[in-house]
């Protein structure tokens, strides 16, 4: 089968399938949709197709990550003549079709957003009646999930030569700036973005040498808010006790 896309500001949502001149395959998705973690987001997707008056069975599909090969997060099927698209798959029950595929609308609602939902999504429609054809948005819509900082781990670890170091890891989008404060410290901004694959929202800051006993506080901040957590270092008989 053959397919293309268009990048246009024209509103094709209400274009009739049987309008003249004949429609060609196209899908309209915005490059990006932004929403905050915990909220819901709508991923718009409308399409046109060349099969006039098509009323046969159809399937609407959304994938994440990659077109064609990416995992499906939503799938529904509508029987011949039906405007009801029965959900067959909704990952974690958080995906719901808002649009009506019979009216060329595959728009999807995603509930209870998490930072892990920050990826590209691709809509697809399949016709399976007298006409066998399918079309997928190859460029997709990027769902950009924002989140206030959250410190996911703070700890004190032994270092060589009976020393100690502190680690603070936080998540957020935009990635938060981390700062340490504590005894005999100013503010240390020794934050480095975690290099681990798939952890792009995690930031880690290390205090390489804790020279004084007391309370060490890690503060994470971005444009949406701030968060802080503390560890306590007490050295006695060469051992350390740390609590948050």
């Amino acid at each position: 089968f053959v397919r293309t896309k268009i990048d246009t500001t024209e509103n094709l949502l209400n274009t009739e399938v049987h309008s003249s001149p004949a429609q060609r395959w196209s899908m309209q998705v915005p490059p990006e949709v932004s929403a905050e973690a915990g909220d819901a987001a709508v991923l718009p997707c409308t399409f046109t197709h060349p099969h006039r008056h098509y009323d046969g069975p159809l399937t609407a599909i959304w994938r994440a990550g990659e077109p064609y090969a990416g995992p499906q997060v939503f799938r529904c099927a509508a029987a011949r003549g039906s405007e009801l698209c029965q959900t067959a798959l909704s990952l974690h029950g958080r995906f719901r079709l808002l649009g009506n595929p019979r009216r060329n609308d595959l728009s999807l609602r995603v509930e209870r957003l998490a930072l892990a939902d920050d990826r590209r999504y691709f809509c697809r429609v399949e016709f399976a009646g007298d006409v066998h054809d399918r079309y997928e948005s190859r460029h997709g819509v990027r769902l950009h999930v924002t989140a206030a900082p959250r410190i996911v781990n703070i700890s004190v670890l032994p270092s060589p030569a009976h020393a100690f170091r502190a680690l603070c890891t936080a998540e957020g989008e935009p990635p938060p700036a981390l700062a340490w404060s504590g005894p005999a410290l100013g503010n240390s901004l020794a934050a480095v973005r975690s290099p681990r694959e798939g952890h792009g929202h995690l930031v880690t800051a290390e205090l390489p040498a804790l020279t004084h006993d007391g309370r060490y506080t890690c503060t994470a901040a971005n444009s949406l808010g701030r968060s802080e957590a503390s560890v306590y270092l007490f050295r006695f008989h060469g051992a350390s006790g740390a609590s948050t």
């Epitope: 990659e66 090969a69 190859r138």
Partner: antibody, heavy 118, light 106 residues
Framework: QVQLVESGGGLVQPGGSLRLSCAAS????????MTWVRQAPGKGLEWVSF????????YYADSVKGRFTISRDNSKNTLYLQMNSLRAEDTAVYYC???????????WGQGTLVTVSS | DIELTQPPSVSVAPGQTARISCSGD??????ASWYQQKPGQAPVLVIY???KRPSGIPERFSGSNSGNTATLTISGTQAEDEADYYC?????????FGGGTKLTVL
């Protein structure tokens, strides 16, 4: 400004290998599918291969399938084409191009010449 | 696989209208794009989605697609428009170009 610059072309013997590079600048490389298109001397354009944003989806023309491998390094803003088992009919100027959201090629490099000859 | 067919050559007098056709069954359902290529240079996109013009392309370039034939029209052709023109389309896994048309401005 938006720019693509190919390199790595040259003279190679039949059966040999060559790796082409395409350095991208002036745009967010990881937001675009990329492609290689070639043009034999005095002939028309022939699409060679596509690669998706992350590199995990690739497509090839039948004429190069199994011999050529497209890849990308988004951290270096660079597209690659590894060409193995080269044949005389692979002689061409190889262009890298950016694919716009309408499945058209909106930015092209200047091309690099690959000559396969003994 | 899809195939796109173009005439090898088209001639036009300066100031006149040049029309270059591209035919193929795929064009009944899918968009065409057009590329201009001058000797020794890389191709340049002049039309996409049948009739859309990228920024920087003169208004004298226009496109249409009817039935199984896409047409590139150059109104008021100028000497600098002399070039090879290629149509293109896409089938989900491969992109195909027509054989190219050499436009000669007499």
């Amino acid at each position: 400004q938006v720019q693509l610059v190919e390199s790595g072309g040259g003279l190679v013997q039949p059966g040999g290998s060559l790796r082409l590079s395409c350095a991208a600048s002036g745009f967010t490389f990881s937001n675009y599918w990329m492609t290689w298109v070639r043009q034999a001397p005095g002939k028309g354009l022939e699409w060679v291969s596509f690669i998706s944003y992350s590199g995990s989806t690739t497509y090839y023309a039948d004429s190069v399938k199994g011999r050529f491998t497209i890849s990308r390094d988004n951290s270096k803003n660079t597209l690659y084409l590894q060409m193995n088992s080269l044949r005389a009919e692979d002689t061409a100027v190889y262009y890298c191009a950016r694919e716009g959201t309408s499945s058209m090629f909106d930015v092209w490099g200047q091309g690099t010449l690959v000559t396969v000859s003994s | 696989d899809i195939e796109l067919t173009q005439p090898p050559s088209v001639s036009v007098a300066p100031g006149q209208t040049a029309r270059i056709s591209c035919s193929g069954d795929a064009l009944r359902s899918y968009y065409a794009s057009w590329y201009q290529q001058k000797p020794g240079q890389a191709p340049v996109l002049v039309i996409y989605d049948d009739n859309k013009r990228p920024s920087g392309i003169p208004e004298r370039f226009s496109g249409s697609n009817s039935g199984n034939t896409a047409t590139l029209t150059i109104s008021g052709t100028q000497a600098e428009d002399e070039a090879d023109y290629y149509c293109g389309s896409y089938d989900g896994t491969v992109h195909v170009f027509g054989g190219g048309t050499k436009l000669t401005v007499l």
